[in-house]
């Protein structure tokens, strides 16, 4: 960075809220599409461009004048394995967090033309192309269609579906936004002949209703209602089903076969929690109990001779915890090998970390391939020769990430292949593989400026730089940046770390105020080596504010001593940790102790008002946005998985103090403000009613702001500038800057 | 490699019963669809129903009351019985298999005579 | 039941020639209409499913069109192996039908 150490001779700009709300200095992304082991797709100038992987050399594999007669924006593309076929997307209309409806049409890539005929109706909730070939499966008003040829008419697999009630290849809300984090659940067979699909039904699970306002016009508001089964409440069922999309007609129903739970999980309330195809003719099917300390994984075959699915007891695969919940969210799936008698599946080890363990399917016991006092992020390709993952090994850093490979013919043999790459830039890896693993792109997103690049897994040279971001590199050298700490503090003889955000010419002799920005949930990370151009640049760069993040316990990838020390009783140690941390940065030297604050969105916005109701005196204001407030406001299946259930006979009375109202008193020494978008479905506007009113009852004065037909992202453009300027005034109001 | 392969021919008596036998191979038969077709000597082909994969069975109206279609998916074969045989079903009969909405392989037929 | 109807029963043409069969149903079939050839020896084979979709391995001489009540078979440049029978049927509804057939034969 040019300029001088000293603030005052410095003259280039800060980066200001400006910048950041209107998105000034642009990270470049190279967003690659693989279509084969050689091959990608990238979008350029809006033309879609095939690359070869080895030379570089690109060609024109879509012109971006093919649609200029559309008469439609479109959203998205897809194009069919086979590469004959492009989806295209519009009328996109956003549900939840990843639902949403959208007309299609399909482009034949070999005609040149559009497809008119037996198209696919407006409205449609999900659409996936067939691994291989061209098929196609699509949910219309909860009903799951199949389409053979693009051209030919759908064929109906179920005819049950019923908004709000009965769910065919889609989630409702609980399972879109807690377990699968999609709206799809349907999953093709690697050749495209079996489609399997859960089918939910919500037909008991209680409604959250609230209001839309919408149009100024509208005298009535819309009331939205969506079944929405909270902490203790009635759940959604679930039946899983297996199609084989060979047998379909027009003059006969298909025959959906089902697949049961195993006996151990009918025996009470369960999920569905991870479909992975194995073979052609082999399924693995991960259920985990309600109460989420137990899952099993099934793994059921084919039988062409009676045309059903059978799973062997004998090969069953039992998952639990004794100190928590099994997985970070949820099991971790499996990665079977070419002959699916085998897998590779991330679970917690005998000392707690999440390892690799390579488990045979007629076998209970599986073997680690890897140990030690740091964990298995992901695992990301699987060849005969070859295991490659992603981990948080390098150097004791848990907020790192880098690409492994580990030899399958001997444990021993592992190699990091992004460590060395770029070592001062790059720590924060992920990546994208070709379709046979031939090649992957890098993704490294810190500390320094994000950096693409292109190698080949035959010898795992590099081959191209694909984006450097110099461009932004340029315009940055004329911005007063703030610059990143990555450290750690040892409490009770355990290392947990934290990030700072310094402002520019950061002098350690001086006093800054200083704003904890937390998150803290379960398996949360909040301390790593990314870099980012957000709210808290700003705050640096041109208030001269250090905003920093600590990683207590509840926090994740450092093993589940610290992960599940919060297990049962959320809004305990995780509050406490970030209360330690500011006294712990207080102590450091060069924090201004009377200037710190707090702010939180989501669990970070329930962490914050639990911190400032504590009365501890070293908070003088911060900001909840969208908080929790009372567990059994919040979704089952997230809050059960932490806290149990809210039944005398189990956890009740944890969940009744740990409520952010029973606080409300302790707000009187602090200055507040409080955020939430009316039309939140996922953190209800009611749980931050009931802060709101719990504080007016007890007479404490704080500020609040609500944003009119926002969700839980407040991400309209117009939301997304008001929030940030309201809490940037009311940040600066707190410390007296001017 | 597909193939179906049809037997039972042979001259039958009016009154009497047919059964036809048809052996299926390179597929499953709980998988896909098998028809009836038959043709009488110099007509066109007329269809006389369908097991389906699950087993489900439709059949013509005009052969509702005589006519069984059954299978044996261990042995890959499927069955056509018709009762009360007169001379007008005299003809080929092919079985096909179900593929989507069209016949995609037929077997090469089997010859059947109903005479005294 | 949904009647089909095929014209002509039988033609004559040279090889070369550009030949077409329609056919006709007695309702809205939408697409759902397949041609058949039937060789002298009676072996059945598909050519032509959903009205104009080539089977695999049919050459593509072979052509369809056509929906709602009315189809064509075209065959576009004939060859001494096109001797045959061809039939359409409909697969929107049971019973399926079939039509009468057209023999062609080269003159």
């Known amino acids: 960075n040019k300029g001088t150490d000293d603030a005052t001779a410095d003259s280039r700009k800060t980066y200001t809220l400006t910048d950041y709300l209107k998105n000034t200095y642009r990270l470049k992304l190279y967003s690659l599409r693989w279509i084969s082991d050689h091959e990608y797709l990238y979008k350029q100038e809006n033309n879609i461009l095939v690359f070869n992987a080895e030379y570089g050399n690109s060609s024109v594999f879509l012109e971006n004048s093919t649609f200029d007669e559309f008469g439609h924006s479109i959203n998205d593309y897809s194009i069919s394995p086979d590469g004959q076929f492009i989806l295209l997307e519009y009328n996109y209309v956003k549900q939840w967090r990843h639902s949403y409806t959208a007309s299609y049409d399909i482009y034949d890539l070999n005609k040149r033309q559009l497809i008119t005929e037996e198209r696919i109706p407006n409205n449609t909730q999900w659409v996936t192309w067939s691994p291989v070939g061209h098929k196609l499966a699509y949910v219309w008003n909860n009903d799951i269609y199949v389409k053979i040829e693009p051209n030919l008419p759908s064929y109906r697999i179920t005819w049950t579906g019923k908004e709000d009630i009965i769910y065919n290849g889609i989630t409702d809300w609980v399972y879109e936004e807690e377990v699968f984090s999609a709206y799809s659940a349907l999953w093709w067979s690697p050749n495209g002949t079996f489609l399997a699909y859960a089918q939910f039904n919500d037909t008991e699970v209680p409604l959250i209703e609230y209001s839309f306002y919408s149009d100024e016009s509208l005298q009535y508001p819309k009331t939205v209602r969506v079944p929405y089964p909270k902490a203790g409440a009635v759940n959604p069922t679930v039946k899983f089903f297996v199609v084989n999309t060979d047998s379909l007609s027009s003059v006969t129903n298909a025959t959906s076969i089902q697949i049961t739970a195993p006996a151990s999980m009918l025996i009470g309330d369960h999920y569905l929690c991870d479909v992975t195809w194995a073979t052609q003719e082999r399924i693995s099917l991960q259920w985990l109990r309600r109460i989420q300390n137990y899952s099993v994984m099934d793994i059921c075959d084919y039988d062409e001779s009676s045309g059903r699915w059978n799973c062997l007891v004998a090969r069953q695969h039992i998952e639990m915890s004794t100190t928590g919940w099994v997985g970070r969210f949820r099991p971790s799936e499996p990665h079977f090998t070419l002959d699916g008698n085998s897998f590779y599946k991330i679970i917690s080890n005998e000392e707690g970390y999440r390892h690799i363990c390579y488990f045979q399917i007629d076998k209970k016991d599986c073997t680690f391939i890897t140990k030690g006092t740091w964990e298995v992020i992901g695992i990301e390709a699987l060849t005969s020769d070859y295991l490659y993952y992603i981990s948080n090994e390098y150097k004791g850093m848990p907020g790192g990430r880098n690409l492994y490979k580990i030899q399958l013919s001997d444990y021993t043999k592992v190699t990091c292949l992004s460590c060395e790459l770029n070592p001062e830039r790059c720590q924060y890896y992920s990546v994208s593989f070709s379709k046979e693993a031939k090649y992957y792109q890098l993704r490294c997103s810190g500390p320094g400026l994000p950096l693409y690049t292109l190698h080949s897994s035959v010898n795992d040279k590099g081959l191209r730089v694909l984006e450097d971001n110099s461009a932004l590199d340029k315009m940055l050298q004329n911005v007063q940046m703030p610059s990143k700490k990555l450290d750690f503090i040892i409490l009770n003889e355990t290392k947990f770390w934290y990030q700072m955000i310094l402002p520019p010419h950061f002098d350690k002799s001086k006093k800054y105020p200083l704003l904890l920005d937390v998150y803290a949930g379960p398996c949360s990370q909040k301390a790593d080596t990314v870099f980012r151009l957000n709210w808290a640049t700003y705050l640096a760069s041109t208030e001269n504010i250090i905003v920093a993040s600590f990683d207590g316990r509840g926090s994740g990838y450092q093993g589940d001593k610290i992960m599940h020390a919060i297990n049962r009783r959320l809004g305990t140690f995780e509050v406490e940790d970030q209360i330690e941390a500011a006294r712990q940065f207080s102590k450091m030297g060069f924090v201004d102790n009377k200037r710190i604050a707090i702010w939180g969105w989501s669990y970070g916005g329930y962490v914050t008002s639990m911190v400032l109701g504590s009365g501890s005196g070293v908070f003088k204001c911060g900001i909840a946005v969208a908080p929790v407030s009372r567990w059994e406001y919040y979704d089952s299946v997230y809050t059960e998985r932490y806290m149990g259930l809210p039944t005398p006979e189990d956890n009740l009375d944890h969940y009744r103090n740990s409520t952010v109202m029973s606080r409300a008193e302790n707000f009187k020494q602090v200055e507040y403000l409080l955020i939430h978008g009316t039309a939140d479905d996922n953190v209800h506007f009611q749980q931050s009613a009931q802060i709101s009113k719990a504080l007016v009852d007890v007479g404490v004065d704080f500020q609040a702001m609500w944003y009119t037909d926002e969700d839980h992202g407040i991400a309209s453009s117009t939301a997304h500038q008001h929030i940030y300027t309201h809490m940037s005034h009311f940040i600066k109001q707190c410390f007296s800057l001017p | 490699e597909v193939q179906l392969v049809e037997s039972g021919a042979g001259v039958k008596q009016p009154g009497g019963t047919l059964r036809l036998t048809c052996t299926a191979s390179?597929?499953?038969?709980?998988?896909?669809?098998v028809h009836w077709v038959r043709q009488a000597p110099g007509k066109g082909l007329e269809w006389v129903g369908v097991i389906w994969g699950d087993g489900r069975t439709d059949y013509d109206a005009a052969f509702m009351s005589r006519v069984t279609i059954s299978k044996d998916t261990s042995k890959s074969t499927v069955y056509l019985q018709m009762n009360s045989l007169r001379a007008e079903d005299t003809a080929v009969y092919y079985c096909m298999r179900n593929r989507h909405d069209w016949f995609d392989y037929w077997g090469q037929g089997t010859t059947v005579t109903v005479s005294s | 039941d949904i009647q089909m109807t095929q014209s002509p029963s039988s033609l004559s043409a040279s090889l070369g020639d550009r030949v077409t069969i329609t056919c006709s149903a007695s309702?809205?079939?939408?697409?759902?209409l397949n041609w058949y050839q039937q060789k002298p020896d009676g072996a059945v084979k598909l050519l032509i499913y959903y009205s104009s979709n080539l089977h695999s391995g049919v050459p593509s001489r072979f052509s369809g069109s056509g929906s709602g009540t009315d189809f064509s078979l075209t065959i576009s440049n004939l060859e001494p192996e096109d001797i045959a029978t061809y039939y359409c049927?409909?697969?929107?509804?049971?019973?399926?039908?079939f039509g009468s057939g057209t023999k062609l034969e080269i003159k």
């Open positions: 309702q809205g079939i939408r697409n759902s």
């Open positions: 390179g597929f499953s038969l709980t998988t896909y669809g």
């Open positions: 049927q409909q697969s929107i509804k049971l019973p399926f039908t």
